[in-house]
């Protein structure tokens, strides 16, 4: 079976000549919701962490990356049930003995406080109130993110977003 | 360190009223190259397969999914050195005893011919001439893809791309 691939609108470069730029404001796709500068997709179904990562990837998005405590709180405020948990893009790197975001950066000590073991095959999920680690093979809901950017209708070669 | 996140222009919905649609043709972002309906990013650095998957995800893209032999050939033609190898979005599923694309579909027997072991922790890479399996922990270059779509400047609520 051929791999069927989700689509994502990439940055526009209509032609290579210098033109006037007019930004269009964007909203988020169906099923996604806007939170500050991001579109978030809170899954309803469940997956192991790796499959969640792959699902976001095939949607040309990323498992949620949380910049700071404010963003964590904003995201947790959108979780409507205290019994529901969502994988985010953070797991334990055994070789580096540290929590690592999927973009390669490490968790800084004053960011999220993770309850649970920091060991091999530990991945991180958030609930309405807390941040936990769990075996990555556990099936849970997950959150994908797309950055919400401006698309310029006419752009010059050096004006990529 | 905070997670820094790549941007991707998501589908445009300028307002909720019915408006005229005018498609804009798209080109690929800087560093990416257009191959048919896709934008491809050939990495310069190396990573284990899992980190490559995560990197594409944070770029709001996917590890390369190859539809057929023609696409394989087109991609291989862009590899300028026969000694260079690139991870793609295909690995061995031990539980299902089959090669599996990261979007969940299985490799059909008449698609790619993979040289190497089909076993646990085997991931697939391509070179200028062939398709191989290797331990997923091996560090290699990788290829990310974004689907190249049309963005409509003015869209009605039900006309998401």
């Amino acid at each position: 079976q051929k791999p069927s691939i989700g689509k994502c609108s990439v940055d526009i470069q209509q032609n290579r000549t210098k033109t006037t730029e007019r930004p269009d404001l964007l909203n988020c796709p169906i099923y996604w919701q806007q939170v500050q500068e991001k579109c978030l997709l809170f899954s309803h179904t469940v997956n192991p962490w790796n499959n969640s990562l792959a699902d976001c990837s095939t949607k040309e998005s990323s498992l949620l990356l949380i910049q700071d405590k404010d963003e964590l709180t904003r995201t947790q405020n959108l979780i409507h049930d205290k019994a529901i948990s969502f994988w985010i893009g953070l797991n334990f790197s055994l070789s580096e003995k540290n929590w690592k975001w999927i973009n390669g950066s490490f968790l800084s000590s004053n960011d999220l406080k993770i309850t649970g073991d920091a060991k091999e095959n530990s991945c991180v999920y958030i609930s309405q109130t807390s941040v936990y680690s769990e075996y990555c093979s556990t099936e849970m809901k997950w959150i994908c993110q797309k950055e919400l950017t401006l698309v310029r209708n006419k752009v010059s070669p050096d004006s990529w977003l | 360190q905070k997670p820094s996140i790549g941007k991707c222009s998501v589908d445009i919905q300028q307002n909720r009223t019915k408006t005229t649609e005018r498609p804009d043709l798209l080109n690929c972002p800087i560093y990416w190259q257009q191959v048919q309906e896709k934008c491809l990013l050939f990495s310069h650095t190396v990573n284990p397969w899992n980190n490559s998957l995560a990197d594409c995800s944070t770029k709001e893209s996917s590890l390369l999914l190859i539809q057929d032999k023609d696409e394989l050939t087109r991609t291989q033609n862009l590899i300028h050195d026969k000694a260079i190898s690139f991870w793609i979005g295909l690995n061995f599923s031990l539980s299902e005893k089959n090669w599996k694309w990261i979007n969940g579909s299985f490799l059909s027997s008449n698609d790619l011919k993979i040289t190497g072991d089909a076993k646990e922790n085997s991931c697939v890479y391509i070179s200028q001439t062939s398709v191989y399996s290797e331990y997923c922990s091996t560090e290699m270059k990788w290829i990310c893809q974004k689907e190249l779509t049309l963005v409509r400047n003015k869209v009605s609520p039900d006309s998401w791309l």
Epitope: Q1, I30, V46, T58 | N103, G104
Partner: antibody, heavy 121, light 107 residues
Framework: EVQLLESGGGLVQPGGSLRLSCAAS????????MSWVRQAPGKGLEWVSA????????YYADSVKGRFTISRDNSKNTLYLQMNSLRAEDTAVYYC??????????????WGRGTLVTVSS | DIQLTQSPSSVSASVGDRVTITCRAS??????LAWYQQKPGKAPKLLIY???SLQSGVPSRFSGSGSGTDFTLTINSLQPEDFATYYC?????????FGGGTKVEIK
Amino acid sequence: EVQLLESGGGLVQPGGSLRLSCAASGFTFGQYAMSWVRQAPGKGLEWVSAISAAGGTTYYADSVKGRFTISRDNSKNTLYLQMNSLRAEDTAVYYCAKPLDSSQWADFDLWGRGTLVTVSS
Amino acid sequence: DIQLTQSPSSVSASVGDRVTITCRASQGISSWLAWYQQKPGKAPKLLIYAASSLQSGVPSRFSGSGSGTDFTLTINSLQPEDFATYYCQQAWVLPITFGGGTKVEIK
């Protein structure tokens, strides 16, 4: 062609068992949660059971809990429903259904043609 | 479980008429509501999802609206092929539930 094809229905006595199968083609089966939905003759639609994409999580309607078991084999692109201790009220056309988006349980954009299960003595 | 109450249970209409069907949820479901059309002997067909999004290939005379607990399916200018039974379905929480159906008949 994108399709779902159910099989395994038939006439069975109360207390008996049947195993329904649903063969999927034309889409990435292993990426989607899947459901069984049934419709008794002349009645409305009733969701029966769902299974996650990886197969590790299952849910059931109260009316079938403890009697029916949903499973899947992603390598064969096939969904199953094992029905035990069948009752007259289980008589229905059984549909398998795929959600529109891989993050969702429902919003079923693809349905099989259905297979009729008749429970009667 | 979330109950969905559809009204009316049946409606008689003529070609060209505007038909409105309502679906009320027993608790708030945000915009997680879908509408299906079913013809005798056939599987249901998805018309509307996420309360107001038209499924690909569905004619634009079908539209959906609402959020929270009250939702509406509207068929503008009813066509002969639209005579069928229509169901709403919530996707907010499991178990997934369907409304009882609305039969659109020829007057």
